[in-house]
């Protein structure tokens, strides 16, 4: 997870846009019993604030201690504040839990900027607005951190939902979701509907508003329109996928598709922006600039430094292009595309100095670690992390922000050849060469 560029909240316009229904996937397989339907108790269980993450309420220990936990599909540790910190309203007090077990092992997690460190243990964990189960899970009790907790974000820990391969200190530390599936009858799948606000929210609005849903163990029909289209999980570490083509307003970027996935492409709810590899970012910005050239935006806008503002209610959405990412499909030589609107990639930002206007930040940025499909992408879609079948599903979110002219879309199938060649193979360090 790109810690430090964190995420947005709820939709102004809900429901299926203009009754739009996408063509149903022709080869859709029959669903497994209990995998689909209504999960009323889990709908609307996420809250969040623009740029600062979506969080779910969890309880830890006996008696239960309630904490808000950031939902992060870009990491694999369950880690919670366990000592006083100026940005934390509350923290996990291990000494008050009769079920806490110390693993007598430390964990240190450095980020590009900042870090957290703590002590490993296990305790009983449940999700009040989740499945009615309690599991014994590994917990990293954060005792020291730098640039990790965010002032005013309202979360006190992080729930890493990715795979054991990227868990710290090593892959022997079982992630929370693995423990949940092993210890209960919850199916090995979860789905996320992150709802972007379309307008900035102040602190009191955030606390009172809904940020979306994390459905644990299933798929909720009410959260999406049209069909779910699935892309294979390339490798079980991050939620890695393969992008095979990129279009801006229907115009192909015409790059070698390896560039789109250099050095990987991941789906990460813990990152705010759509982050693109340098060459891809430059090509995309050039194309978006050309498409929106009726207005002259400052260079700082494309860098994410300057806001652009319009008189309230007059944002010219139509001058900005849609962005389509084609993802490898489940069938050989078949792909599908997901299309986002400027309502997803222009992030509303409140600034008192320009409060009479609607102001936005450009939420596409450059990456040196591959493509990161962060909240900017996820807020357009209902995203199914089908771990059991090693695939990720996308459907148009019932809460995505759009206008009367355009809507986010998930469409297919498209014929795309040689998609395997689009994946980048990260050179493996040969352990034996490190021996002295």
């Amino acid at each position: 997870t790109q810690h430090g560029i964190r995420l947005p909240l709820r939709s102004g316009l809900g429901g299926a846009p203009l009754g739009l229904r996408l063509p149903r996937e022709t080869d859709e397989e029959p669903e497994e019993p209990g995998r689909r339907g209504s999960f009323v108790e889990m709908v609307d269980n996420l809250r969040g604030k623009s740029g600062q993450g979506y969080y779910v309420e969890m309880t830890v220990g006996s008696p239960p201690q309630t904490l808000n936990i950031l939902v992060d599909t870009g990491s694999s540790n369950f880690a919670v504040g366990a000592a006083p910190h100026p940005f934390l309203h509350r923290y996990y007090q291990r000494q008050l839990s009769s079920t806490y077990r110390d693993l007598r092992k430390g964990v240190y997690v450095p980020y590009t900027q900042g870090k957290w460190e703590g002590e490993l243990g296990t305790d009983l964990v449940s999700i009040p607005h989740g499945p009615n189960v309690t599991v014994r899970a590994n917990i990293a009790a954060i005792t020291e951190s730098d640039k990790f907790f965010i002032n005013g974000s309202n979360w006190e820990g992080i729930l890493g939902l990715a795979y054991a391969e990227i868990a710290r200190p090593d892959d022997s530390l079982e992630p929370f979701f693995d423990s949940l599936v092993k210890q209960t009858h919850v199916p090995n799948l979860f789905s996320l509907q992150l709802c972007g606000a379309g307008f900035p929210l102040n602190q009191s609005e955030v606390l009172a508003s809904v940020g979306g849903s994390m459905i644990i163990g299933g798929i909720d029909h009410s959260l999406y329109t049209g069909s779910l289209w699935y892309t294979p999980i390339r490798r079980e570490w991050y939620y890695e996928v393969i992008i095979v083509r990129v279009e801006i307003n229907g115009q192909d970027l015409k790059m070698d598709c390896k560039e789109y996935n250099y050095d990987k492409s991941i789906v990460d709810s813990g990152t705010t922006n759509l982050r693109l590899p340098k060459k891809v970012f430059e090509a995309a910005v050039k194309s978006i600039k050309a498409a929106s050239s009726t207005e002259k935006f400052p260079d700082g806008f494309w860098l994410g430094e300057q806001l652009v503002c319009w008189q309230a209610g007059t944002t010219p959405w139509n001058i900005f292009p849609v962005i389509s990412l084609y993802l490898m499909g489940e069938v050989t030589n078949q792909s599908f595309r997901i299309t986002i609107l400027p309502q997803q990639y222009l992030r509303p930002v409140e600034d008192v100095a320009t409060s009479q206007d609607d102001c936005y930040k450009f939420a596409i940025s450059q990456s040196s670690t591959g493509t990161v499909m962060g909240a900017v992408i996820m807020e357009g879609f209902y995203v199914v992390f089908d771990r059991a079948r090693k695939r990720i599903g996308f459907a148009v979110s019932a809460c995505h922000v759009h206008d009367e002219f355009r809507t986010a879309a998930v469409e297919g199938p498209f014929v795309t050849l040689d998609m395997e060649d689009c994946g980048y193979n990260i050179p493996q360090t040969d352990e034996s060469t490190l021996m002295t």
């Epitope: 430090g4 964190r6 740029g51 207005e295 002259k296 260079d299 503002c309 600034d351 100095a353 102001c359």
Partner: antibody, heavy 116, light 107 residues
Framework: EVQLQQSGPELVKPGASVKLSCKAS?????NFWIHWLKQRPGQGLEW???????????KYNQKFKAKATLTVDTSSSTTYMHLSSLTSEDSAVYYC?????????WGQRTLVTVSA | DIVMTQSQKFMSKSVGDTVSVTCKAS??????VAWYQQKSGQSPKSLIY???HRYSGVPDRFTGSGSGTDFTLTISNVQSEDLADYFC?????????FGGGTRLEIK
């Protein structure tokens, strides 16, 4: 209320270095970049560079690349500017300012005097 | 670098007058121009952004206009508290640059 609180005046010797600070409050610190500017009497305002508090990415005016280094501490919502190898040319008033559209908010100024 | 030129260094006006401060960019900067007021011994105060938008709390006596290369800050019904230096700034491209300033004196 948005505020940028700058550190106090500095009297430094030629060849020495100095570190100025700018503590932000009243907004989400990681949402907006911080800029540093220089003003000498009769020479107007000059933009030194900027830093993104969310990931410490920096961009400098070529003219100040060898002179200024910007850093950030998000835990205290503070941005720093380190000025090295000071000469009389560096005697000036320095400002931090917050981005948004242009520079809506400015710090209260820090006077740096370089004198033997 | 883009050069911002404020050709008038000083302007003298009486209370109640209207004054126009001009600024010329050496190349097209669209509408990406801001204006600041700086009183003696103080930090600059933001007045105008996007060439013509007033920042919150700025009196409507201050208006901005222009696009491309020519920009104007107009102060109508000048008050004694308007005694200050006025700077234009382009934020269209890096490095950001400022005009040399125009000092408004009150007769």
């Amino acid at each position: 209320e948005v505020q940028l609180q700058q550190s106090g005046p500095e009297l430094v010797k030629p060849g020495a270095s100095v570190k100025l600070s700018c503590k932000a409050s009243g907004y989400t610190f990681t949402n907006f970049w911080i800029h540093w500017l220089k003003q000498r009497p009769g020479q107007g305002l000059e933009w030194i560079g900027m830093i993104d508090p969310s990931d410490s990415y920096t961009k400098y005016n070529q003219k100040f690349k060898a002179k200024a280094t910007l850093t950030v501490d998000t835990s205290s919502s503070t941005t720093y500017m380190h000025l090295s190898s000071l000469t009389s040319e560096d005697s000036a008033v320095y400002y931090c300012a917050r981005s948004g559209v242009a520079f809506p908010y400015w710090g209260q100024r820090t006077l740096v005097t370089v004198s033997a | 670098d883009i050069v911002m030129t404020q050709s008038q260094k000083f302007m003298s006006k009486s209370v109640g007058d209207t004054v126009s401060v001009t600024c010329k960019a050496s190349q097209d900067v669209g509408r990406n121009v801001a204006w600041y007021q700086q009183k003696s011994g103080q930090s600059p105060k933001s007045l105008i952004y996007s060439a013509s938008h007033r920042y919150s709390g700025v009196p409507d006596r201050f208006t901005g206009s222009g696009s491309g290369t020519d920009f104007t800050l107009t102060i109508s019904n000048v008050q004694s508290e308007d005694l200050a230096d006025y700077f234009c700034q382009q934020y269209n491209s890096y490095p950001y640059t400022f005009g040399g300033g125009t000092r408004l004196e009150i007769k």
